[in-house]
Structure formats: C-alpha cells, structure tokens
C-alpha cells in the first residue's frame, strides 16, 4: 500500500455568506495501509483562524462499507462529546454535545463531514471520525488549534525607546527588531488563551533614527516602523 | 492470500437464466462489499451491482434492474450472480470483484466467467 | 450516472517515452477532499489489476513509472517510461456511490 505523506494543504474560500472557510480533508496521499484489524489512526494537528467556518473529513471509505460513524468532540474543561450515525437505521444520536455551531455537513449518509461554523476559541480540542465497518474501525482525528490575530501597536514611550505589542493574539507572537537593541520582552497570559506579548527596546547608538517592529504570527506577519524622536511621537496601530 | 474463485463457462439459449458463483477464501466473506462487471467480446468494462455479504444489501446498475440478482451463502463464502431473460448482447465475460474500504478501490478480482448466449 | 470519457482511445508508443491518459468525468468524483477516480490494466484474458486509487496513490507492487493526477472531474493516467509489458487496454472507475468506468484505452508499444 502507499506509504503515509505528511504533506497537508489547506484549502480556503469564500462562502457566499462572505465567511471564510477552511478545510483540511485533503491529502489524497494519506495514510493508507495493509488491510489488518487494526486500522492506523490518522491524527493531525491544525490551525485555524477564529471566526472562519471549518470542514472536517472522515477516511475515504464509501457509506455502502459502513456501519456506524461517529465524531467524537472532546473540547477543553467539557464533557465529550459525540455525534454517532447508524445506517442500518438512518439514525443520528447525540450525547452531551452543545455548541450549535458544530453540525454534520449535511445528512450524514449523504455526507460524513463535521462543520464548524464561525471557528471560536473554545473550540480548541480534539476532533475525531471514527468509522465502523465489519472488519474494524478507521480513524481520523483532528487536534484543532484555533488562531487569533493580535492586533499590533507601536509607540515611543521615552527618549529613544520603543514600544512595540501584539495584543490578545493565539498563540503568543514573536517580537523581532530591525535594527537590534537593548530589548525586554513580557508576556501576559489571558484567561481566553490569548497572550499579549509587549517588547520594549532601547537604542543608545544615536545615527539609528528609524525602528522597525517585525511581528511573527501563525496567521499572518506585520512590520511597523518609528522614527525615534527625543520626545514620544505618533502612536501606530494595526491588525496583521 | 486473498482469493476469488469463479464458475466455469456457461453456454445459454436466449431467454434462459445464468447463475455465476465467486467463492471467495483468505478473509472474512462478510467483511467485504462484492461488485459484478461485465465486458463482451473486444468492448470495455461495465458495473452491473454489488451484494454486501455483512447485511445482504444489494444495488443494482438501472440497467439490469429486474433482470439481475445477486445474493451469498455465508457458510460456503459465496456470492452469486443470477442474470435472467437472456439474450446474445448479454454474451460477455462476468467478473466479480471485491472493494477495499479505503477508497473504495478494488484490489481484488475473480479470474473471469465466460457465459455464451447463442440459439 | 456521471459518465467516464477517456481519451485518445488508443494510443502507439515507443519504449522510453512518455503516455499519457485521460479521464474525463461528467461531473465531479471528488468529494470530503478525495477523489474516488482509480486506474486499471487490463491485458489480453485477463481480469482487470488495480494501478492507481483515490487519484494518485500508487498500489501496493505497481512501478512507480505509473503515476496518477488529477481532482474534480479532470484525470490523467501517466506511464513514464514505457516498457513493453504495458501493452494493455487502461480504463478509469469512480466508485462514490453507483460506479462506472470509462470505454477504455488500448496502449500498444511500437
């Protein structure tokens, strides 16, 4: 059978509701294997922008092979979750799950796919399709990790030092300089998961007269750039 | 190993009925989707329906529908084929084929049924 | 039904050199991100054998000179380079839900 490939592309688009849309099902070269009793559990790790609608897939196997599907949900500080359908009855069975926004796609026996619909950060976790047939189970589970954009500011607050913030972002952003200073770097941690990082740089050499800002984030990166004036200037403000 | 094994050849007069027989061995008979093909002398490969050994359930190409039925014998492991009113178009090589699950491909086929409808 | 159209219909090549396949579906085989389009061979008194699955995956004991592309509705088989065993009749088979396969493509060697 061919062997497991890594490789994951990410599809995104636009729904006619203007939201966008994620969906990691594919990777047409997945994970597939001698036929045993025991069928690999697939996992992957996936980030997804909040406030985006997500698609979640099952293996490729045709509902004519199945018994039972089911999506296992377990979010963080919740009690499990589970969406099951039976096709022998056409039956579809919840248990402690709800969070409206996650649905089936559709009619399960058209269509086994989960949606998420407008990613929120509690919707961090652990997403699993488990499907049944009459030789064993096949898995594919999903560690859904939701991504907020942190919004940026920079600022000279003393003379010749600068301030630079990513503000509520997930995960915590990364703070670089152009040129290097005499940096300190905190970071707070929200009780929502987000973390605002703020980086403070102090420049002694007197011909450096502009700073930039570089900030690295999973969704995305943004530079800011100051003059350095002998008196606090223009505060700058932005989203990545 | 995985094998499918297949009836002999048959020789049919026109509107009489044929019934193929695929003993399958080397895996669990009703863990497995079986598929039916058919492909007449120098022409291309056509489904004609699956039988689910695991629940009995079966589905039919529209056109074979009353015409054909497929069903099992869980205690010899096979499936079989029955192809009715028949006639020289039905003239072909009957093939029957196991679906794997991931996918849904076939990895598996029997060796092949010849049936001659002739008057 | 979604119908299966391969081209050319047959197809003559020398040995080292590049064939190429085509499957058109009449409409899309894929879905939940797979496309359910698999190659067979077939060679003279032979059952089909199985060459590619989901689109691109190679199965398990096919040379790695056959490859397999293509999402949506637009396939391609490609054997590269052929040798003068891959003188068979090729077809493409969507297997969703009800299956069809293709008319088929006879490859001979030159």
């Known amino acids: 059978a061919a062997q497991p490939n890594n490789s994951l592309m990410l599809q995104t688009s636009k729904e006619n509701h203007a939201l966008a849309s994620s969906s990691l099902c594919m990777d047409e070269k997945q994970i597939t294997q001698n036929y045993s009793k025991v069928l690999a559990e697939v996992n992957t790790s996936w980030p997804v922008k909040m406030a985006t609608n997500a698609v979640l897939c099952c293996p490729p196997i045709a509902l004519r092979n199945l018994i039972i599907i089911t999506w296992e949900i377990i979010l963080r500080g919740q009690p499990s979750c589970t969406k099951a359908y039976k096709k022998e009855t056409n039956e579809t069975k919840e248990t402690n799950c709800t969070d409206e926004r996650i649905t089936w796609v559709s009619r399960p026996d058209q269509n086994s796919d989960l949606q998420i619909r407008t990613v929120a950060i509690t919707h961090d976790g652990y997403y699993r399709c488990i499907m049944v047939t009459p030789d064993g189970n096949f898995h594919r589970g999903y560690h859904l990790q939701v991504l907020v954009t942190p919004e940026v500011t920079l600022f000279q607050n003393r003379n010749r030092t600068a301030v630079c913030k990513a503000v509520a972002g997930k995960p915590a952003a990364h703070i670089s300089w152009i040129p290097e200073g005499d940096c300190a770097t905190k970071q707070e941690y929200w009780s929502n998961g987000t973390v605002t990082v703020k980086s403070t740089c102090h420049w002694e050499v007197h011909n450096v007269s502009t700073v930039t800002c570089h900030v690295s984030h999973l969704t995305g990166n943004k530079s800011l750039y100051i003059e350095l004036l002998p008196v606090p200037g223009a505060k700058k403000s932005a989203k990545l | 190993q995985v094998q499918l094994v297949q009836s002999g050849a048959e020789v049919k007069k026109p509107g009489a009925s044929v019934k193929v027989s695929c003993k399958a061995s080397g895996y669990t008979f009703t863990s497995y989707v079986m598929h039916w093909v058919r492909q007449a002398p120098g022409q291309g490969l056509e489904w004609m329906g699956y039988?689910?050994?695991?629940?009995?359930?079966?589905n039919y190409n529209e056109k074979f529908k009353g015409r054909v039925t497929m069903t099992r014998d869980t205690s010899t492991s096979t499936v079989y084929m029955e192809l009715s009113s028949l006639r020289s178009e039905d003239t072909a090589v009957y093939y029957c084929a196991r679906e794997d699950y991931y996918g849904s491909r076939w990895g598996y086929w029997g060796q092949g049924t010849l049936v001659t409808v002739s008057s | 039904d979604i119908v299966l159209t391969q081209s050319p219909a047959s197809l003559a090549v020398s040995p080292g050199q590049r064939a190429t396949i085509t499957c058109r579906a009449s409409?899309?085989?894929?879905?939940?991100?797979?496309?359910?389009m698999h190659w067979y061979q077939q060679k003279p008194g032979q059952p089909p054998k199985l060459l590619i699955y989901l689109a691109s995956n190679l199965e398990s004991g096919v040379p790695a000179r056959f490859s397999g592309s293509g999402s949506g509705t637009d396939f391609t088989l490609t054997i590269n380079p052929v040798e003068a065993n891959d003188t068979a009749n090729y077809y493409c088979q969507h297997s969703r839900e009800l299956l069809t396969f293709g008319q088929g493509t006879k490859v001979e060697i030159k």
């Open positions: 039988i689910n050994p695991y629940n009995d359930d079966t």
């Open positions: 409409k899309s085989v894929s879905t939940s991100g797979y496309s359910y």
